[in-house]
């Protein structure tokens, strides 16, 4: 039978660490991490790490009992957890019978938004107590709400990941810029900022009709040339406060008729601010 892995939590040092080993298995040949989605009962889904590793193809894998994987996450707070993956059989060959290296994976470490993870793995038995053993580590930075997978998470939807404000902005005259955008039922307060290397104008927008999508319009006084300036729209939603996803547009000249500039010439540009 071919070896498989059985993985479970192991928070402290592995018991083998206390024992003296004449020989230990070699290090891993490769270690990779990628996010995968799994649905959960609430109708939302969670993002988990798929940690996969490749064993070095030589006789030292005959000594291999397990591989231990530890993950440290750094964002607002630090997290640390480890799993030990035991091999169900001794290795009878250095490569898979069908060809290629022995490759295993573990899916289970949860992934939070916008977090840097340090994933380390080592084979067991590992080095003796006062020796450095072979190990391998990789970094993985989880994406934020702008990511094509993450944006459908409930937390991100509530932070406006699926909201497209369709910003249009045009220079009415030397002193004012008209900004139009589609509101969202997620919140009723917005800040429109006009920047041309420095901030040349801003306005708070309060939209009382929170329950339905409407097209809001605001005329903003400016203190400098606004043509080509960037409009930044910051929403204030209950779930993300002042840290919601920001959207951008560009100021163009208003048409002579005085109506706002058509949408298709000025696509909204997602900003880089994430919850």
């Amino acid at each position: 039978r071919e070896p498989t892995v059985q993985c479970g939590s192991e928070t402290g040092p592995s018991p083998e660490w206390m024992l003296q080993h004449d020989l230990i298995p070699g290090d891993l040949r490769d270690l990779r991490v990628e996010p995968v989605t799994t649905s959960v009962a609430t109708g939302d889904y969670s993002i988990l790490m798929n940690v996969s590793w490749v064993l070095r193809a030589d006789a030292s894998i005959r000594l291999l009992k397990a591989t231990k994987i530890c993950v440290t996450g750094k964002s607002n707070f630090q997290s640390y957890s480890c799993v030990r993956c035991n091999y169900t059989e001794a290795f009878q060959t250095q490569t898979r019978p069908s060809g290629g290296k022995w490759t295993f994976s573990y899916i289970g470490f949860p992934v939070e938004l916008n977090t840097v993870y340090f994933i380390g793995a080592h084979n067991i038995p590992n080095a003796n107590m006062n020796e450095d053993g072979p190990s391998m580590s990789v970094n993985f930075t989880s994406p934020g709400c702008l990511d094509h997978i993450m944006k459908y998470k409930k937390k991100c939807v509530k932070a406006g990941s699926l909201w497209d404000p369709n910003i249009t902005a045009c220079k009415k005259n030397e002193e004012t810029v008209e900004v139009n955008f589609t509101t969202t039922p997620l919140g009723n307060r917005y800040m429109a900022l006009i920047q041309h290397s420095t901030i040349i104008g801003f306005s708070q927008v309060f939209e009382p009709h929170q329950k339905k999508q409407t097209r809001a319009s605001v005329v903003i006084p400016v203190t400098g040339d606004s043509e080509g300036a960037t409009v930044q729209l910051t929403p204030y939603f209950p779930t993300c406060g002042s840290d919601c996803i920001r959207h951008k547009g560009t100021v163009v000249l208003c048409p002579q008729t005085g109506v706002p500039f058509p949408l298709d010439n000025n696509k909204s540009k997602p900003g880089g601010w994430l919850p």
């Epitope: 193809a57 030589d58 006789a59 250095q94 290296k101």
Partner: antibody, heavy 118, light 107 residues
Amino acid sequence: EVQLVQSGAEVKKPGASVKVSCKTSGYTFISYWMNWVRQAPGQGLEWMGRIDPYDSEIQYAQKFQGRVTLTRDTSISTAYMELSRLRSDDTAVYYCARSGGFDWFAYWGQGTLVTVSS
Amino acid sequence: DIQMTQSPSSLSASVGDRVTITCRASENINSNLAWYQQKPGKAPKLLLYDVTNLADGVPSRFSGSGSGTDYTLTISSLQPEDFATYYCQHFWGPPYTFGGGTKVEIK
């Protein structure tokens, strides 16, 4: 029946390169590492390196690093060993040898004599 | 690199004799050892692997023993076709090395 059939004898001048082929049959080529071993006249066996035909991972003996190149062509189940900057002490019989479950050499080619002479 | 030291480098024996060849590794190779037989002008032939396992078609008069760093190949009753050179090889991990060989000659 597992067979490893090597290319014929070569005579080369110092500084030249030689490429030896090893055509395999009777087993799944990508399932076993292929090793190269040489034997100078009247001398013992010397391991040069190995290649995993599955993904072309290669490991060389330090002595040959930078001078030997191992390749493979899975479409014709053939492994190759190229040795460059030949010297007279590279005169030897070169063998391909297929690994077993681990790196004992279960099957050998018939050998290719490479003579380096000016 | 692991060094493999074989002894003796040559020996003379008669048909029917019991022959023992030893191989010492410079460090523990955890029984990852193979023995080969080579006749003049021919490729080596695998005799034993994992110290004691006979390769396909190898007569039972060949046997192996040992562990750690010290290993032995024994031919219980030497036959005329056994006159050849014998090599040990470790496969604990690359680079793989062979012993210097033991030539078994007719007395």
